[in-house]
């Protein structure tokens, strides 16, 4: 009889902790209960964005960002003149350092860079680096977007007012402004070099909670090589406590990055909770969604001759954008139940994001190894309501591996969902 | 805000063919899709094709080659050879974009076609 | 193809409520969706996804499913909501598309 079962989601290899090493090398820690502390908030599931303002009030405000900037309808401001910017050429010191926070990885800036211009009220300095990326293939990841384009990262570099603060920290928890520039990454043919010491520090920070020190690098260089096309809106922190107090400055010309350098971002795991218990996954699709923009106003830059250049080379190509990739995030919270004793339930929930609606059907994977043997198996589940698939003739003895990819209308996929690994071990009694 | 607007609707003898165009404002193409669905006199509503951010188009099984849609800065709806069967309120709508399901959110006012010789 | 059926017609009184069906094989896997739409206008979208309403749609409009049968209730009725009521879904794989829209019900409000 089914005495027991295992289940667990699959993880890469390499995972250094609390790991099991399943038959097919792939390493997977078993979930572990939160350890109370600060409120708690994710990117999905019960901690995600809609639930932010149970514990942050402020995430509920009128004056939210991320938004989406429609260029037609962005006036442009006198007031926004070109930015000055200071000691951005100079090359970071040995104690700029990265850490994996679990929801983004930031850059800890240890030098010198302050900011003006651009309508901000006074000269700002910039204290810390954060990335927002998707799930793969140059998926959307930005949480800004304009005209509804969104690009694979954004990268977000956050300023306070050192003559009126102490600290960054200090500025935030007496609610009053700070700066922030969002810049977009575009995919790119080649590798960007400027971004090497961001990549190469990518992969000493893989785990939640790791941090190391970064090779030099220049923040300038990081920015778009036209900085005189921006946008400018009051908004709020894109994570809780979301508060409003962020002048936010969006560039609207991308830097390059290529798929090679992307693949550090997708890298990156995070430790989740859901249901009370921890597990390690994949950081992925670290965006909040967009807010509404109610009673505000997007500006944009006034500096001579900086919009002539149109969009078009870069937000009409579609090289790396998720329109010419992947149909969806991948479907969501899998699961894997016994049935009875010969039959399992695959359940899952939709993507959180789907760029090209609608999803027509699923396609469960399955595969399983006995007697050394491996085995696999594929079958469309026509719904995009019903989301359970039963496997019957299942064997009790059995390592079976379940995964399941979203096809959209256009027969585009979405990635594949996590790995479900399910052990049914049996017992006499 | 966005929104859509048809054009191109007016009285044709059967045969001869008629291009109805739907000029948007607001609206991203490359990033939503925008359907074609019609409505004869007194009738219910009846879905015709669609084309996607990417070109890709799909039509009603009973269309079989009687419209074509396309698209450059507007969407076009080519009705190929009109019968009296197409005398109706030609309506363009943008597809909700990123939901799981496909609804139309956001409607033009329609424009009339009349067929008859 | 597939075909979603509604009644053609259906009275309310004034004030009460009122239940508008939508019937097809495809529904017990498919969302549907309901568009309410007045002489001479366009249709505008009132439930998606079975039960979700778009914001600006009185929450007296709410939509369910259960098996092969999605159903728009409207609480409370006033002499604007009379209209034609259509429910719709796609179908299809991933190389074929398909969206369908039920006959329609004309709703008529009295008293």
């Known amino acids: 009889v089914l005495h027991y079962v295992v289940c667990f989601p699959a993880l890469t290899e390499g995972y250094v902790g609390a790991l099991h090493e399943n038959r097919h090398g792939s390493a997977v820690q078993i979930r572990r209960r939160k350890a109370s502390g600060d409120p708690y908030w994710a990117y999905s599931g019960a901690y995600g964005p809609e639930h932010w303002v149970t514990s942050s009030v402020s995430c509920g405000g009128r004056h939210q960002s991320p938004i989406d900037i429609l260029d037609q309808y962005a006036r442009v401001g006198e007031e926004y003149q070109e930015l000055q910017l200071d000691g951005f050429d100079n090359e970071s010191s040995n104690k700029t350092w990265m850490k994996n926070t679990g929801k983004t990885v930031a850059i800890l800036l240890k030098d010198d860079y302050f900011v003006s211009g651009a309508g901000l009220p006074g000269r700002f300095k910039a204290e810390k680096v954060e990335f927002h990326w998707g799930h793969s293939n140059g998926s959307a990841g930005s949480e800004h977007s304009i005209n509804g384009r969104r690009f694979p990262v954004e990268m977000q570099i956050f300023f306070y007012n050192p003559d009126d603060f102490d600290s960054f920290q200090t500025a935030i928890s007496e609610n009053r402004i700070i700066g922030a520039m969002a810049i977009f990454f575009q995919v790119s043919p080649r590798d960007n070099s400027a971004l090497d010491p961001i990549i190469h520090g990518l992969k000493g920070v893989v785990h939640h909670e790791k941090e190391t020190f970064l090779d030099p690098f220049v923040l300038r260089d990081l920015l778009p090589a036209s900085l005189g096309s921006y946008y400018r809106y009051t908004g709020s922190l894109t994570t809780p406590p979301c508060s409003e107090i962020v002048e936010w400055i969006v560039f609207r010309r991308p830097v390059p990055i290529s798929y090679h350098q992307l693949e550090a971002f997708y890298s990156i795991f995070t430790t989740e909770q859901q249901d009370h218990v921890k597990s390690v996954e994949y950081l992925r699709n670290n965006f909040r969604p967009q807010q509404r923009l109610h009673d505000r106003v997007v500006s944009k830059s006034a500096v001579r001759d900086s919009w002539n250049h149109d969009m078009t080379d870069f937000l009409e190509n579609p090289l790396g954008t998720e329109a010419s990739k992947v149909c969806s995030s991948p479907p969501i919270h899998m699961k894997v139940q016994p049935l009875n004793q010969t039959a399992l339930q695959v359940s899952w929930s939709q993507p959180e994001t789907i760029y090209h609606p609608p999803i027509m059907n699923y396609m469960i994977s399955y595969s399983w190894t006995k007697n050394e043997d491996e085995k696999e198996k594929t079958f469309t589940k026509d719904s995009d309501k019903d989301l359970k698939a039963t496997i019957s003739h299942v064997s009790p003895d059995s390592l079976y591996l379940f995964r399941v990819q979203a096809v959209c209308r256009n027969d585009m996929r979405s990635d594949f969902s996590q790995t479900m690994l399910f052990q049914a071990n049996t017992t006499r009694i | 805000a966005q929104s859509v607007e048809e054009s191109g609707g007016r009285l044709v003898t059967p045969g001869t063919p008629l291009t109805l165009t739907c000029t948007v404002s607001g609206i991203d193409l490359s990033s939503y899709a925008m359907s074609w669905v019609r409505q004869a006199p007194g009738k219910g509503l009846e879905w015709i094709g669609v084309i996607d951010g990417s070109g890709s188009t799909w039509y009603a099984n009973w269309v079989k080659g009687r419209f074509t849609i396309s698209k450059t800065t507007t969407v076009d709806l080519k009705i190929t050879s009109p019968t009296t069967e197409d005398t109706a309120t030609y309506f363009c709508a943008r597809e909700d974009y990123g939901s799981e399901t496909i609804d139309f959110n956001i409607w033009g006012p329609g424009t009339l076609v009349t067929v008859s010789s | 193809s597939f075909v979603l059926t509604q009644p053609a017609s259906v009275q309310v009184n004034l004030g009460q409520t009122v239940s508008l069906t939508c019937t097809a094989d495809?529904?017990?896997?498919?969302?549907a969706s309901w568009y309410q739409q007045k002489p001479g206008q366009a249709p505008v979208l009132l439930i998606y996804?079975?039960?979700r309403r778009p914001s600006g749609v009185p929450d007296r409009f709410s939509g369910s499913s259960s098996g092969n049968t999605a159903t728009l209730t409207i609480s409370g009725a006033q002499a604007g909501d009379e209209a034609d009521y259509y429910c719709a879904t796609s179908d299809g794989s991933g190389s074929s598309y398909q969206y369908v829209f039920g006959g329609g019900t004309q709703l008529t409000v009295t008293g």
């Open positions: 495809t529904l017990s896997r498919r969302y």
């Open positions: 996804r079975d039960t």
